[in-house]
């Protein structure tokens, strides 16, 4: 598909509306601490640019590719050193250097403050004085911290946030309208950002035939009645779209990702019974409905696996002249069969499948070296299996928030150097896996838990690897994709690992403790857990529990108090005191 | 009934190259996954290359991934294949099949390619 001018193809393909919120979100992407109002004024000068190569292909710079375009804009920012330092560097190159230059210095944890959420009449008011300027702020502000993001699916939260205060600031009590609504958005878009963070991680630093396989697995599971072939050209298509905006060319992503709709919507009959609904919606709506689809029924008279892969004598022939598509078709057979497994373990079986038929082909009798390959998998179902049972039993007896302080104690000790904002950010999203998938029926807590495991632990690999202090995470995290969760359970206790000296400071708390919200107040004493942890790495449970309850109960006794400051100037000491004699 | 029709095949020097073209009849063509396979002299049979309905190409043997393009015209019910760049180890003849759910379901007669200097 060749175009004179690929800006005004993109202008032209996705309307004005879209082509200026994803250019937005892709300079915010880019450029992170740069002000809204700067940011604004560069996609103008885009916006404006692109009409007039819709008006004539042929102006001058139109002929132009997106990302020279978009590059010479992001460089015209006279305050590039200053603000972001060695990123500056990236403009003495050419393309397509300077933009990977632009993407390897995108920031996972940007130092940007948390966002506060205003009064609901101020927020309406500002809805109401300027629609445009509001929603746009929402995207400059969700995608600066979230760089990450797909941007496609960005533009559906916005919509979502737009219909939400349409709706909620007629409504007789705003707040209870609009709160619930603006919360389900935040956790949902965190969820959104961390689960595409993963596709891209995926890409990246595996490479697209690891996405490609992933894709396989979850789109048979997906789709068990579409024809390996089907499935085939959606993984082909789907891997276009991610490698797109993950590549920072949100653009063509979005035009990609409509284009693949279209097609999905087209060819339900061959795809998905489930598709239906979906198709009726708008486009920003359908996509996303599209990519949470339900699984379609299995069908009813699928055939043995063994006889195709393990009992037919011609299995090193059909493997030795097309491996990626036998190894794909077993994936695509034992996935769409298996919907009550992670992609992870699907993966993990494809792997263990692989690699059998590279030793036993090799052997002197190659079927009888790989009749026994469906007993080998048994080891590996049954680890995530255990797993899932024992974590879900531990979370619904303990409730969330113990059940994330258990994971919290277990962490630190297997990775005691990483920092502790992190371990507590990644150990809290961990323990969610309870409430997230506990209460599914037997046949959906696997899939639920592990791949969801998958992404918060992508988390913890993405932000270890902006400031590297454990050869135990690097390892987990570069050796196998696949293996990852399996390789964090698997680590114990570090020996190596010298305690932290006791800082008095770390345990020192004030009267602000008590206006904090229920999570902030979790958060502040999940952090001195850690802290404690990483002190007596060998401190027990009950020892942690005792600390942990006297903590409470201090923090209780300070918020009652008259003088709450004179309290815990009093009580902080002497608490100090009793825990390290507790874990001495 | 189904038929498959290959033609293009012929002496080529190596580094030349050749289009193979398939005339399909007797079936829904623009509703069927289609490949090329090809059996060298003394030798199995050998994938080349498949492509989807929509003409997204789902394969390429590493043997002829960015020598080779395999496209299609529905409209025409037609299915080629581009070989640039020959070897003397494409030498084959080469099979155009119609794919069905897991595997070739119907081949053509095929086409001789020799790539002798």
């Known amino acids: 598909d060749t175009h004179k001018s690929e800006v005004a193809h993109r202008f032209k393909d996705l309307g004005e509306e879209h082509f200026k919120g994803l250019v937005l979100v892709a300079f915010s992407q880019y450029l992170q601490q740069c002000p809204f109002e700067e940011h604004v004024k560069l996609v103008n000068e885009v916006t404006e640019f692109a009409k007039t190569c819709v008006a004539d292909e042929s102006a001058e710079n139109c002929d132009k590719s997106l990302h020279t375009l978009f590059g010479d804009k992001l460089c015209t920012v006279a305050t590039l050193r200053e603000t972001y330092g060695e990123m500056a560097d990236c403009c003495a190159k050419q393309e397509p250097e300077r933009n990977e230059c632009f993407l390897q210095h995108k920031d996972d944890n940007p130092n940007l403050p948390p966002l506060v959420r205003p009064e609901v009449d101020v927020m309406c008011t500002a809805f109401h004085d300027n629609e445009a300027t509001f929603l746009k702020k929402y995207l400059y502000e969700v995608a600066r911290r979230h760089p990450y993001f797909y941007a496609p699916e960005l533009l559906f939260f916005a919509a979502r946030y737009k219909a939400a205060f349409a709706e909620c600031c007629q409504a007789a009590d705003k707040a209870a309208c609009l709160l619930p609504k603006l919360d389900e958005l935040r956790d949902e878009g965190k969820a959104s950002s961390a689960k595409q963070r993963l596709k891209c991680a995926s890409l990246q630093k595996f490479g697209d035939r690891a996405f490609k396989a992933w894709a396989v697995a979850r789109l048979s599971q997906k789709f068990p009645k579409a024809e390996f072939a089907e499935v085939s050209k959606l993984v082909t298509d789907l891997t276009k779209v991610h490698t797109e905006c993950c590549h920072g060319d949100l653009l063509e992503c979005a035009d990609d990702r409509a284009d693949l709709a279209k097609y999905m919507c087209e060819n339900q009959d061959s795809i998905s019974s489930k598709l239906k609904e979906c198709c009726d919606k708008p486009l920003l709506e359908k996509s996303h409905c599209l990519a949470e689809v339900e699984n379609d029924e299995m069908p009813a008279d699928l055939p043995s696996l063994a006889a195709d892969y393990v009992e037919s004598k011609d299995v090193c022939k059909n493997y030795a002249e097309a491996k990626d598509v036998f190894l794909g078709m077993f994936l695509y057979e034992y996935a769409r069969r298996h919907p009550d497994y992670s992609v992870m373990l699907l993966l993990r079986l494809a792997k263990a499948y692989e690699a059998t038929l590279e030793k036993c082909c090799a052997a002197a009798d190659p079927h009888e070296c790989y009749a026994k390959v469906f007993d080998e998998f048994q080891p590996l179902v049954e680890e995530p299996q255990n797993l899932v049972k024992q974590n879900c039993e531990l979370f619904e007896q303990l409730g969330e928030y113990k059940f994330q302080n258990a994971l919290l104690v277990r962490y630190t000790k297997k990775v005691p150097q990483v920092s502790t904002p992190t371990l507590v950010e990644v150990s809290r999203n961990l323990g969610k896996v309870g409430a997230k998938c506990c209460k599914l029926p037997e046949a959906k807590r696997m899939p639920c838990a592990e791949d969801y495991l998958s992404v918060v632990l992508n988390r913890l690999c993405v932000l270890h690897e902006k400031t590297p202090v454990s050869e135990k995470v690097t390892k987990c995290c570069t050796e196998s994709l696949v293996n990852r969760r399996p390789c964090f359970s698997a680590l114990e206790l570090d020996e190596a690992y010298v305690p932290k000296a006791f800082n008095a400071e770390t345990f020192t708390f004030h009267a602000d403790m008590c206006t904090l919200s229920e999570k902030e107040k979790q958060v502040k004493k999940q952090t001195a857990l850690v802290e404690l942890v990483k002190h007596k790495p060998k401190a027990t449970k009950e020892q942690l529990k005792g600390v942990m309850d006297n903590f409470a109960a201090f923090v209780e006794k300070c918020c009652k108090a008259d003088d709450k400051e004179a309290c815990f100037a009093e009580e902080g000491p002497k608490f100090v005191a009793a825990s390290q004699a507790a874990l001495a | 009934e189904v038929q498959l029709l290959e033609s293009g095949g012929g002496l080529v020097q190596p580094g030349g190259s050749l289009r193979l073209s398939c005339a399909a009849s007797?079936?829904?063509?623009?509703?069927?996954?289609m490949g090329w396979v090809r059996q060298a002299p003394g030798k199995g049979l050998e994938w080349v290359s498949l492509?989807?309905?929509?003409?997204?190409?789902?394969y390429y043997a590493d043997s002829v991934k960015g020598r080779f393009t395999i496209s299609r015209d529905n409209s025409k019910n037609t299915l080629y294949l581009q070989m640039n760049s020959l070897r003397a180890e494409d030498t084959a003849v080469y099979y155009c099949?119609?794919?069905?759910?897991?595997?070739?379901?119907?081949w053509g007669q095929g086409t001789l390619v020799t790539v002798s200097s």
């Open positions: 007797g079936f829904t063509f623009n509703h069927y996954t």
């Open positions: 099949a119609k794919w069905s759910s897991r595997a070739f379901d119907y």
């Open positions: 492509i989807h309905p929509s003409g997204t190409v789902i």
